[in-house]
């Protein structure tokens, strides 16, 4: 997984434009897979898209997402997730100009083509969990996480801290 230590490992990214007034600490290209090692894949056209959670063929390249890491403006209440007491947030982009968005009304994870500055719905608080896994909590709806439901990504409400380790909201990041 690519957690705080990974962020510190990479050089700071230089950006000509800032997002919601802040620039990323760094950016990282990684494949995204579930706790059970299924791959998150994307099929995009100009006017439509699909996001799949599936087993990949042996020779098939894994789709990658560009994770842009930000320090949030709010101090972290939890240990291990922040830098200097602040929460880490990420945006996830599978290709240029497209970002994952949280649709809290529909409890869905969507892909939107948009320009910077990105809306709050595109930001997720990054949590480093056990077994080299991470989870993504909606900035706009605390307690709601990106998760897997019926072989698709969805928003899943986590009621208690014990449920933070539930497998369907855990993801692995890999450079391969």
């Amino acid at each position: 997984a690519f957690g705080i230590s990974g962020v510190q490992k990479y050089t700071r990214a230089l950006h000509d434009s800032s997002i919601t007034g802040i620039s990323p600490i760094t950016e990282y290209l990684a494949s995204l897979s579930t706790y059970n090692d299924q791959s998150i894949t994307f099929a995009l056209e100009d006017e439509s898209y699909e996001i799949y959670v599936e087993d990949l063929k042996k020779d098939e390249k894994k789709d990658k997402v560009l994770l842009s890491y930000y320090e949030s403006q709010h101090p972290s209440n939890e240990s291990g997730d922040g830098v200097d007491g602040k929460m880490l947030m990420v945006t996830l982009s599978p290709t240029k100009d497209f970002w994952l968005h949280a649709n809290n009304k529909e409890h869905s994870v969507e892909l939107h083509k948009c320009e910077k500055p990105l809306p709050d719905q595109a930001f997720f608080v990054l949590h480093n969990m056990h077994s080299n896994c991470v989870s993504f909590e909606c900035k706009t709806d605390p307690g709601v996480f990106i998760g897997v439901k019926d072989n698709h990504l969805a928003l899943i409400k986590v009621d208690s801290s014990e449920n933070l380790c539930t497998e369907n909201i855990l993801f692995k990041l890999s450079e391969t």
């Epitope: 995009l44 100009d46 063929k57 020779d59 098939e60």
Partner: antibody, heavy 126, light 106 residues
Framework: EVQLLESGGGLVQPGGSLRLSCAAS????????MSWVRQAPGKGLEWVSG????????YYADSVKGRFTISRDNSKNTLYLQMNSLRAEDTAVYYC????????WGGGLRYPFGYWGQGTMVTVSS | SYVLTQPPSVSVSPGQTASITCSGE??????AAWYQQKPGQSPVLVIY???KRPSGIPERFSGSNSGNTATLTISGTQAMDEADYYC?????????FGGGTKVTVL
């Protein structure tokens, strides 16, 4: 509606050069990887070359490597194939093809061809 | 370089099932696509990622891929299905087509 319109074909002598163009419309051209595929008279399809939509990386079949150059002008929504040192065996209909999906980070060519042009005929003969 | 092998021709009676094979080393580890080409026309994608049909392609077209062989199946073949069919895969960002199979509807 996705449209791909090839042009630039014709008769050329062995050793000569030709530049093919493919004018694209109906989609965000810069987002998609594009390829050239050819078909010799009475023969099957042969992939010739492809170009990324992410970083303009280029890829070639061994049969044309060092002789053909693929390029794109995203501001003009146009794909090109510069063909040099042409041989009789390059005689074919040349199709421009668009990937089915927008190219993702990580690059490489790996998607099926969702859309094809009508083709332009290249004849190499003395 | 990677090679895909198809039978040159397949004959089928109307309403019957036509199966076209495409063989290659460890073919099942790759995603296969299939294209239909009618005389004087450009190819059309009929199957991608082994089994998926693009919108507008009839349900009678289906695909499978395992081991060393991918197969395109046309169930209830119609006269309009008479065409050349090509399989295609990517091998390290190099496109590879099979030699093509002419399907004749008797």
């Amino acid at each position: 509606e996705v449209q791909l319109l090839e042009s630039g074909g014709g008769l050329v002598q062995p050793g000569g050069s030709l530049r093919l163009s493919c004018a694209a419309s109906g989609f965000t051209f810069s987002s998609y990887a594009m390829s050239w595929v050819r078909q010799a008279p009475g023969k099957g399809l042969e992939w010739v070359s492809g170009i990324s939509g992410i970083d303009t990386s280029t890829y070639y079949a061994d049969s044309v490597k060092g002789r053909f150059t693929i390029s794109r002008d995203n501001s003009k929504n146009t794909l090109y194939l510069q063909m040099n040192s042409l041989r009789a065996e390059d005689t074919a209909v040349y199709y421009c093809a668009r990937d089915l999906w927008i190219q993702l980070w990580g690059g490489g060519l790996r998607y099926p061809f969702g859309y094809w042009g009508q083709g332009t005929m290249v004849t190499v003969s003395s | 370089s990677y090679v895909l092998t198809q039978p040159p021709s397949v004959s089928v009676s109307p309403g019957q099932t036509a199966s076209i094979t495409c063989s290659g080393e460890r073919m099942g580890d790759k995603y296969a696509a299939w294209y239909q080409q009618k005389p004087g026309q450009s190819p059309v994608l009929v199957i991608y990622q082994d089994t998926k049909r693009p919108s507008g392609i009839p349900e009678r077209f289906s695909g499978s891929n395992s081991g060393n062989t991918a197969t395109l199946t046309i169930s209830g073949t119609q006269a309009m299905d008479e065409a050349d069919y090509y399989c295609q895969v990517w091998d390290s960002s190099t496109g590879v087509f099979g030699g093509g199979t002419k399907v004749t509807v008797l």
